[in-house]
């Protein structure tokens, strides 16, 4: 009876996500059969989040809207480990929008989810950011420095990275 009600709850939760994500990939967390964490297929997972590389080229605003339609945001990078995971799925000859912008052109960078911007946990290429007109951040590859962040014009279309919390059922 308990298992039946748990299954019903799971099914209703899955139905909730079905409008955005017709397919979920779930894994059992720990040893308890009752704890499953899911990411939409074909998103990738790292720690408690799911990631999607959007290869469509769009402005920063449209990229963020595209992520939000899927129940996500442009990626907020909190640690070096998280960035190291993300770059495994990126192409060296492409640039990808992050969820980081400087809306007023005042060098007051902010994350889309209101995570405090911490100068000590940033991965800007050397000499970046460097332009008041470039109010949005991308991650890209430079042969001299590997992967890092750069500020660019927000209206210039780029690929992007979406991030959402894992779905627990």
């Amino acid at each position: 009876n308990f298992m039946y009600s748990k299954t019903v709850k799971r099914l209703s939760k899955l139905r909730e996500y079905q409008q955005y994500h017709p397919s979920l990939t779930c894994v059992m967390e720990g040893k308890d059969i009752e704890d499953w964490s899911c990411c939409p297929t074909p998103w990738t997972s790292f720690q408690s989040s799911c990631y999607f590389i959007s290869t469509g080229m769009q402005s920063w605003t449209k990229s963020q809207k595209n992520c939000s339609v899927m129940g996500a945001d442009l990626v907020v990078i909190n640690t070096r480990e998280e960035q190291d995971f993300i770059i495994q799925n990126l192409k060296r000859n492409s640039s990808y929008f992050l969820g980081l912008s400087d809306p007023g052109g005042r060098r007051h960078w902010q994350w889309v989810d209101q995570t405090p911007y911490n100068e000590n946990v940033t991965f800007w290429h050397s000499g970046e950011p460097n332009n008041l007109d470039e109010r949005c951040a991308i991650i890209n590859f430079r042969s001299s420095e590997e992967w890092g962040w750069n500020d660019i014009h927000c209206h210039v279309p780029q690929k992007s990275i979406c991030k959402m919390k894992k779905i627990y059922i």
């Epitope: 052109g105 060098r107 460097n130 332009n131 008041l132 007109d133």
Partner: antibody, heavy 118, light 107 residues
């Protein structure tokens, strides 16, 4: 080549306003913000503020807030700066300068002399 | 606001001399230091950006160096056309601020 052409010298009365212009050419106007810089007679350069030619928003030096209004006309690739409630202290050469990489002003207009005199 | 100090307001040198102009910031400006030349007719030109990078068309006799709070501009072989006032400017923090200028004259 990049050029910033400023309007001519102005003589204005105390308490009046003046609007000076800066027309950009030789580049995509809306890709580069426009800075304004003041130089009082015999003095050094002083940063007034910057306006985004794309978004239209401005960042002012606190010292000039309430004194200066910056605007942009994208259709004519022209930036404007209006100075209000003029006093003799506002007598100066006013420069426009294009924003560049590495927080720099890479090209400058020739300057506009504003003289406030009764 | 960050204060920029050019301790020498005027400098006299001979043609062919090596001339160094210094600039000090009131706090670390992370190399966001630029140099401008203002000719006697009022024309202003960018010479050097981000401490040591030569702007397009600027002769190689001009060079810049420094870090943290201390920066300098060097003219290695002074020419007649270099007679001007030189200003440093920090772009690290708004509002951007300039040094008071160093006027270069010929002996």
């Amino acid at each position: 080549q990049v050029q910033l052409q400023q309007s001519g010298a102005e003589v204005v009365k105390p308490g009046a306003s003046v609007k000076i212009s800066c027309k950009g050419s030789g580049y995509t106007f809306t890709d580069y913000s426009m800075h304004w810089v003041r130089q009082a007679p015999g003095q050094g350069l002083e940063w007034i503020g910057v306006i985004s030619t794309y978004y239209g928003d401005s960042n002012y030096n606190q010292k000039f807030k309430g004194k200066v209004t910056m605007t942009v006309d994208k259709s004519s690739s022209t930036a404007y700066m209006e100075l209000s409630r003029l006093t003799s202290d506002d007598t100066a050469v006013y420069y426009c300068a294009r924003n560049g990489n590495f927080y720099v002003m890479d090209y400058w207009g020739q300057g506009t002399l504003v003289t406030v005199s009764s | 606001d960050i204060q920029m100090t050019q301790s020498t307001s005027s400098l006299s040198a001979s043609l062919g001399d090596r001339v160094t102009i210094t600039c000090q910031a009131s706090q670390d400006i992370s190399n966001y230091l630029n140099w401008y030349q203002q000719k006697p007719d009022g024309t202003v030109k960018l010479l050097i950006y981000y401490t040591s990078n030569l702007h397009t068309g600027v002769p190689s006799r001009f060079s810049g160096s420094g870090s943290g709070t201390d920066y300098s501009l060097t003219i290695s072989n002074l020419q007649q056309e270099d007679i001007a006032t030189y200003y440093c400017q920090q772009g690290n923090t708004l509002p951007w601020t300039f040094g008071g200028g160093t006027k270069l004259e010929i002996k």
